[in-house]
């Protein structure tokens, strides 16, 4: 697989609007950095079904971000 290059986000395009909650193993939030100037929400799916990018502007992503931030701070 291609290696990440500086100035490149992990996600391609805006991402999906929603992922079935039952399919979510884990949600990770990548905050803006030197590599990517936007927030990215990465969903790890259950049963080794890979990962998907969630549109950070979607309702579901906003809820996830809120939940994670509440947990961390």
């Amino acid at each position: 697989f291609p290696m990440f290059k500086r100035g490149r986000c992990l996600c391609i395009g805006p991402g999906v609007k929603a992922v079935k909650v039952a399919d979510i193993e884990k949600a990770s939030i990548m905050y803006p950095s030197n590599n990517c100037d936007k927030i990215e929400v990465i969903i790890t799916l259950k049963e080794n079904k890979g990962q998907r990018c969630l549109n950070p502007k979607s309702k579901q992503a906003r809820l996830i971000i809120k939940k994670v931030e509440r947990k961390n701070f």
Partner: nanobody, 126 residues
């Protein structure tokens, strides 16, 4: 209804070229990643190449780097795979697929794609 239709396959001699087309209908390519995959008899479906319609970035499996070129025409809602210097081991059914929310790391993984075409046969033989 979302549909992907591949065309351009056929029989070609080793060293020859083919251009595959993947025409999308029922959705626009914007925001989607289009991937090309292939499956040889008795083998797993493997990722060959992918292209992002949002930023135009392209991805290739090591086995086809320098020989295959992926491109897109958003106006025609079509993605192409130009295959040069074909080898007998390139013989397979070639599929195109569309996915949204794809990570760069997962472009060549079939898990990243939601919609698939029916495939087109490519045979490389003398």
């Amino acid at each position: 209804e979302v549909q992907l239709v591949e065309s351009g396959g056929g029989l070609v001699q080793p060293g020859g070229s083919l251009r595959l087309s993947c025409a999308a209908s029922g959705f626009t390519l914007d925001d989607y990643v289009i991937g090309w995959f292939r499956q040889a008899p008795g083998k797993e479906r493997e990722g060959v190449s992918g292209i992002s319609s949002s930023d135009g970035s392209t991805y290739y499996a090591d086995s086809v780097k320098g020989r295959f070129t992926i491109s897109r025409d958003n106006a025609k809602n079509t993605v192409y795979l130009q295959m040069n210097s074909l080898k007998p081991e390139d013989t397979a059914v070639y599929y195109c697929a569309a996915g949204m929310g794809v990570l760069r790391l997962w472009v060549l993984s079939k898990l990243s794609y939601d919609y698939w075409g029916q495939g087109t046969q490519v045979t490389v033989s003398s």
